[in-house]
Interface confidence: medium
């Protein structure tokens, strides 16, 4: 048997590859028609999502997904046991944390029960589908009289994440942005006492132990400055 | 039906590059899915690479993967494997293979296939 593993080129499109775009549905078969594409997401690598667009078959159709793990001891087709739903009609399937294998190669099929040789399948690595939680317990100390430290946490791996913090006044029209690395913690040297500062920090699961495009969502936002600073010179952790 | 015929075969030599054509006729070429398939003298049939319809999302198995590329051109029904760096290893029979439905890795999964043609790259 060959025993070659199967590597997307880059990241998956989300482009909807498996949607028939090229010729009116009516001139062809329901047999013929492509399958809607499957998108996966690992949440926290806590459980993952798979959806597919229901409203893109001819008529309502419950698509069944299969998955396995490609060359690996985990190869055996396994059935979906928890659908998602939209209508009434299958649009999705979670995983538990269990059957999730980060850095195998990540099989996905999904199939027109009516139709057994109407079937799709895709390849994903799900190491660049990871989407972690929000930064959590953000808070401010004043390292010296111009120099604040924005510390947070993660509900995950922290050398596995990196963060884009965003900060601005009230004064500014738009955000300014900082990159930084697994530390989880960003220094702004140069304060204005006399302005109110706004933080906030997201989180994505890259470069160290994969190569995911999205991001978390924003975490609450942390006040610093003007009305609070006479409270505590020292720490702060004000959320809106 | 659509009907698939490679092109483009022959000896190279190790370390060179070749590409190789599939021309698709008789059917709606967009609305395919392309596979390519090699068999190596007294081998089973292998995988090698797939692109999707609308040539967007492509595979490797991970023995070409960063030295072959697949490519399709819808005008001109046209899918193509691109191979550098190639290895004696490389030497086989290589076949289009088309399904309607999304990207496949099993042979077993495409409805179409062309007669292949022969790669043979000497050391």
């Known amino acids: 048997l060959n025993t070659t593993i199967l590597t997307p080129n880059g990241n998956e499109d989300t482009t909807a590859d498996f949607f028939l775009t090229t010729m009116p549905t009516d001139s062809l078969s329901v047999s013929t028609l492509p399958l809607p594409e499957v998108q996966c997401f690992v949440f926290n690598v806590e459980y993952m999502n798979c959806t597919w667009n229901s409203s893109s078959e001819p008529q309502p159709t419950n698509l069944t997904l299969h998955y396995w793990y490609k060359n690996s001891d985990n190869d055996k087709v396994q059935k979906c046991s928890h659908y998602l739903f939209s209508e009434e009609i299958t649009s999705g399937c979670q995983l538990q944390k269990k059957e999730i294998h980060l850095y195998q190669t990540f099989v996905v099929q999904l199939q027109d029960p009516r139709e057994p040789r109407r079937q799709a399948t895709q390849m994903l690595k799900l190491q660049n589908l990871v989407i972690p939680w929000a930064p959590e317990n953000l808070t401010l100390h004043k390292l010296s009289e111009s120099q604040l430290e924005l510390n947070w946490n993660n509900r995950f791996l922290n050398h596995c994440l990196e963060h884009l913090v965003q900060y601005r006044t009230d004064w500014d029209h738009s955000w300014t942005e900082q990159s930084v690395d697994y530390r989880h913690k960003f220094s702004l040297p140069s304060v204005d006492g006399q302005k109110r500062y706004t933080f906030r920090v997201r989180s994505r699961f890259n470069p160290l132990c994969g190569s995911a495009q999205h991001w978390s969502e924003w975490s609450h936002p942390i006040h610093w400055g003007s009305n609070t600073s006479k409270e505590n010179p020292f720490l702060f952790a004000l959320e809106a | 039906e659509v009907q698939l015929v490679e092109s483009g075969g022959g000896l190279v030599q190790a370390g060179d590059s070749t590409t190789i054509s599939c021309v698709a006729s008789?059917?709606?070429?967009?609305?395919?899915?392309f596979g390519w398939f090699r068999q190596a003298p007294g081998k089973e049939r292998e995988f090698v690479a797939t692109i999707s319809q609308r040539g967007s999302t492509s595979y490797y198995s991970d023995s070409v993967e960063g030295r072959f590329t697949i490519s399709k051109d819808n005008a001109k029904s046209t899918v193509y494997l691109q191979m550098n760096s190639l290895q004696p290893e490389d030497t086989a029979v290589y076949y289009c293979?088309?399904?309607?439905?999304?990207?496949?890795?099993?042979?077993?999964?495409?409805?179409?296939w062309g007669q292949g043609t022969l790669v043979t790259v000497s050391s």
């Open positions: 293979a088309a399904r309607y439905y999304g990207v496949d890795y099993r042979s077993t999964s495409y409805d179409f």
């Open positions: 008789g059917g709606s070429f967009a609305t395919y899915a």
